[in-house]
Interface confidence: low
């Protein structure tokens, strides 16, 4: 994992003293534009938890590997999510810190929760200031769940997340309904990509057994050690006040790591430094406890004493985590009887030894089968053993055989022989085999005969369009499975090659020979049928259709709607580019036209069977709008409308339609028919007094025509409220059509 730590100073009496520091222990980290790549970034992440804008925060760089954020003016500035990004290239890593307001209504019992895939996560929000309203849980800013206020258990609101999966990771919050978001309890859930104790693609590899609260990284199997511990399994404690992967960093200030929260790369999350606990990391561990958040228990034996930073301190003559082991003549510990490496790799071999006097780096050596002696390049000294690390030169086949680790001290010597097998990475002898093809996918059997050694751990399939110079696409698959290459182009040739890997570093073999595979474009077979259609205007038609919805893939890219105007001998085609679509609105049609309509499924350039046709008659277009509409109030409940007939009428008007609406009103308008088309005025009765109304009208021949201009007029006086508008044209009362 990248050596990146985000420190939060939690002495919160004065926000202006609050600071965040991001420290990188990576070689050359943060130097920016030179060969080491991008600098350290430290910023507030406002995507999920937004706080009121304030003065900009100040960023100060201290050398190449440290950056500090200051300038918080008020407590609300602190609430939310902060992130530090460091490392270069594929090692670029983001470390996240979530800050809760100490005065919030709800506080998290524990901010960071790291769980394994498939576990049940329980987030617990403790009531700090009670409100008798529901509690809303959110996930990454989106609504997730609601708890009734009296569902609190022992003063806590619990959110249970069973069978969590990596996509469940993120920022969770619990907030009282209608309370400020700043009073929320914020949590961070980290879901490892594997079950407990497993890592790697397919989670097939076993974690090393991280000690002292270290967390196994699900991608590379390394232990992410709590602040204050180091070593491949976090087996060694740093001196008080130190942190970083090699204990190289020192906590600032005279009180060491008190009051600091340490955030490390996922899947560790955040905790207090070693020896401290509490929501503000200001409380020392209780007797018998040690480590980050004081989560570990000493249980020292044989007179050992508990140090809250490092655990058991053993008296002379004893060693071990609990001082349970006595010193003795040197002894090689836990040496595997057989090791396997891949050809041309440069592995590291560890050899651990214990004894009294204690073995040191120079007292442990490694002998190859040809008699060459290797001296260790590095030694990890722990209370109960010394582990010497040997960097082996590039392996050749002749290195297969028995190797020996030997330890010598004045107390004696010990040696342990072990077998090293040098394996040859597999190389395919044949091209992969095509099983089935579709328009956008190829199903391939990738496992072919190969030279070299098995077992095959992963199969990589490399593919790209034939004769293309673009990068190869790669898919990694399980050796026992057929591979489906997805999202391909129809009717296209693809060059496909296999690369095999065996377990271990350097296990990738050379690419096998290429083969050409061509995608298909099968004809769509399903016949749609027209379910219905309705006219939405003189030139608009809404059409809906169905398919026999059946199991299996739908062979089709979309639908083609065809409208045949037999009178004019014209065909209109409308493409609906979603195979899920079942409705379309056709616009710009010719009013009064008789159309024949059908629909068919298409796939690539192929058309499926057309639906049985439908025959649709669009209504003719209506007359032009009436002219010079004018409104005149006659009383507190009557308004007279006058107008002029439309010009250039295509036929005799059958009626006029008047639309009446209260100005600024939200209700539906009223439509009133004027059934005497020769009239050019009408009186609308039954209106409310002192009320402003809007009027417009249109004529009808066979279809309704265009609306006139809208006119406004107010009724007079302050009479009684009328029952609703009616219309009178000269002497005759007309019906109301709403």
């Amino acid at each position: 994992a990248v050596d990146l730590t985000l420190l939060a100073n939690l002495r919160l009496t004065d926000p202006q003293r609050f600071f965040l520091t991001c420290v990188s222990g990576e070689a050359g980290a943060g130097r920016g534009s030179d060969a080491w790549g991008p600098p350290l970034l430290l910023e507030k992440d406002d995507r999920i938890v937004r706080t009121p804008p304030g003065p900009p925060l100040r960023l100060a760089r201290n050398g190449s590997h440290q950056v500090t954020l200051r300038g918080f003016s008020k407590p609300s500035d602190l609430v939310g999510v902060f992130s530090c990004v460091g490392g270069a290239g594929a090692r670029r890593t983001r470390v996240i810190y979530v800050h809760n307001s100490p005065g919030a209504h709800l506080l998290p019992d524990k901010v960071t929760h790291t769980v394994n895939k498939g576990d049940t996560a329980v987030l617990s929000a403790r009531v700090h200031k009670e409100k008798q309203t529901d509690v809303i849980w959110k996930s990454n800013g989106s609504y997730f769940y609601t708890l009734d206020w009296h569902e609190a258990q022992d003063g806590r609101f619990l959110l249970q997340l069973p069978n969590v999966q990596p996509p469940s990771s993120g920022i969770y919050s619990a907030t009282y309904l209608e309370a400020s978001p700043l009073g929320s309890a914020f949590f961070r859930l980290i879901v490892r990509g594997c079950g407990a104790g497993r890592w790697g693609p397919g989670c097939t590899k076993e974690c090393p057994g991280c000690l002292h609260g270290g967390v196994c990284h699900d991608h590379d199997g390394e232990c992410v050690c709590p602040p204050g511990f180091t070593g491949t399994r976090c087996e060694q404690a740093c001196r008080e006040g130190r942190f970083g992967q090699s204990c190289q960093e020192q906590c600032p200030g005279i009180s060491g790591c008190r009051g600091l929260t340490f955030c490390l790369p996922d899947p560790y999350g955040c905790s207090c430094g070693s020896g401290w606990r509490g929501s503000q990391c200001q409380e020392a561990c209780a007797p018998g406890h040690f480590g980050a958040d004081c989560r570990l228990q000493c249980q020292c034996q044989n007179g050992g004493t508990c140090d809250r930073f490092s655990g058991c301190v053993c008296p002379s003559g004893w060693h071990g985590v609990h001082c349970e082991k006595s010193d003795r003549i040197p002894q090689i510990l836990n040496m595997a009887s057989e090791l396997e490496f891949n050809l041309e790799t440069m592995p590291r071999i560890n050899c651990a030894a214990a004894g009294n006097p204690f073995p040191v780096r120079g007292s442990i050596e490694l002998r190859k089968p040809d008699g060459t002696v290797l001296l260790s390049t590095k030694a990890i000294v722990e209370p109960e053993k010394t582990t010497a690390e040997f960097e082996v030169p590039r392996l050749v086949l002749a290195d297969s055989g028995f190797w020996e680790c030997r330890v010598s001290t004045s107390g004696g010597q010990d040696s342990r022989r072990f077998k090293v097998n040098v394996k040859v990475p597999p190389v395919p002898l044949a091209a992969p085999r095509l099983l089935t093809k579709q328009s956008r996918q190829l199903v391939v059997s990738p496992l072919v005969s190969f030279s070299g050694d098995g077992p095959i751990s992963t199969v990589r399939l490399h593919y790209r369009p034939q004769d293309s110079t673009m990068d190869w696409s790669t898919i990694v698959v399980d050796p026992s499975e057929n591979v489906t290459l997805m999202n391909l182009r129809p009717k296209t040739g693809y060059s496909v090659r296999v690369q095999l890997s065996r377990p271990g570093e350097g296990g990738e073999g050379a690419w096998g020979p290429p083969t050409l595979m061509t995608t298909d474009c099968p004809e769509p077979l399903l016949q749609p049928w027209l379910e219905g259609w309705h006219v939405e205007g003189t030139d608009r038609l809404r059409v809906s259709w169905s398919l026999p919805l059946v199991p299996g893939p739908l062979v089709g890219d979309g639908f083609l709607l065809r409208l045949w105007d037999g009178t004019r001998g014209q065909e209109r085609r409308e493409n609906v580019s979603s195979p899920q679509a079942r409705t379309a609105l056709l616009t710009g049609l010719t009013p009064g036209t008789h159309y024949q309509l059908d629909v068919q499924l298409y796939h690539c350039t192929l058309l499926g069977p057309a639906s049985p046709p439908a025959h649709v008659l669009l209504p003719p277009s209506g007359p032009p709008a009436p002219r010079h509409l004018h409104a005149q109030a006659l009383s507190d409940s009557e308004i007279q409308l006058t107008w002029k007939h439309p010009e250039a009428l295509p036929g005799p008007i059958s009626k006029y339609v008047v639309e009446v609406q209260v100005a600024g009103g939200a209700g539906d308008p009223l439509w009133i028919d004027v059934d005497r088309p020769e009239e050019t005025s009408t009186i609308i009765r039954g209106l409310n007094a002192s009320t402003r109304y809007l009027f417009r009208m249109r004529a009808s021949i066979q279809g309704l025509g265009d609306w006139s201009n809208t006119v406004e007029e107010s009724t007079l006086g302050n009479g009684l409220q009328a029952e609703g508008p009616v219309q009178e044209s000269r002497a005759a009362e007309e019906g109301l059509d709403q």
Partner: antibody, heavy 117, light 107 residues
Framework: EVQLLESGGGLVQPGGSLRLSCAAS????????MLWVRQAPGKGLEWVSV????????YYADSVKGRFTISRDNSKNTLYLQMNSLRAEDTAVYYC??????????WGQGTMVTVSS | DIQMTQSPSFLSASVGDRVTITCRAS??????LAWYQQKPGKAPKLLIY???TLQSGVPSRFSGSGSGTEFTLAISTLQPEDFATYYC?????????FGQGTRLEIK
């Protein structure tokens, strides 16, 4: 009335062949996906095969793949299942069914196939 | 293949009771789940498709719910004609698979 009627079942020896038919009426047969499902005595339902409207697509359960062939004659509104290399474990009531809206909405009354020496 | 597991396999209840039958898929099947009722010597009858849509002519006391991998068939008030065997079925991918069935008997 929408109806499916199976026929062609009977007693056959292991290794023998049988052809089942399913006559459809009351709906436009050529528009629908059709399927065969079977049920061994006292056991649950097992999907056997499916054919798409034009006959161009067919799928089979692993237990019958290579031995059974599904086909249809849209002009005769009839679905077929040709069963070769029959085994004792193929003994079951065979139902034909119509597929629509991701379900089997119409089923025949079934025909019994017994494979025994 | 997607395995469908029904529970319980056997259920004893009285007329007027509310009963639920659960169906679990070995992997996600979206909402592509149907429920069937079968009486001895008869062909299965479609009750519910697309997880919760009632087939035409099926009484409203039958209802379905769920999505992904967990699904439920509920009968709100048992009637004498409801005592039968019930099957769930996934239509997400081939091979189409059925649950092993739940036999509902009169107590």
């Amino acid at each position: 009335e929408v109806q499916l009627l199976e026929s062609g079942g009977g007693l056959v020896q292991p290794g023998g062949s049988l052809r089942l038919s399913c006559a459809a009426s009351g709906f436009t047969f050529s528009r629908y996906v059709m399927l065969w499902v079977r049920q061994a005595p006292g056991k649950g339902l097992e999907w056997v095969s499916v054919i798409y409207p034009s006959g161009g697509y067919t799928y089979y359960a692993d237990s019958v793949k290579g031995r059974f062939t599904i086909s249809r004659d849209n002009s005769k509104n009839t679905l077929y299942l040709q069963m070769n290399s029959l085994r004792a474990e193929d003994t079951a009531v065979y139902y034909c069914a119509r597929g629509v809206l991701r379900a089997f909405d119409i089923w025949g009354q079934g025909t019994m196939v017994t494979v025994s020496s | 293949d997607i395995q469908m597991t029904q529970s319980p396999s056997f259920l004893s209840a009285s007329v007027g009771d509310r009963v639920t039958i659960t169906c679990r898929a070995s992997q996600g099947i979206s909402t592509y789940l149907a429920w069937y009722q079968q009486k001895p010597g008869k062909a299965p009858k479609l009750l519910i498709y697309a997880t919760s849509t009632l087939q035409s002519g099926v009484p409203s006391r039958f209802s379905g719910s769920g999505s992904g991998t967990e699904f439920t068939l509920a009968i709100s008030t048992l009637q004498p004609e409801d005592f039968a065997t019930y099957y769930c079925q996934q239509l997400n991918s081939y091979p189409i698979t059925f649950g092993q069935g739940t036999r509902l008997e009169i107590k």
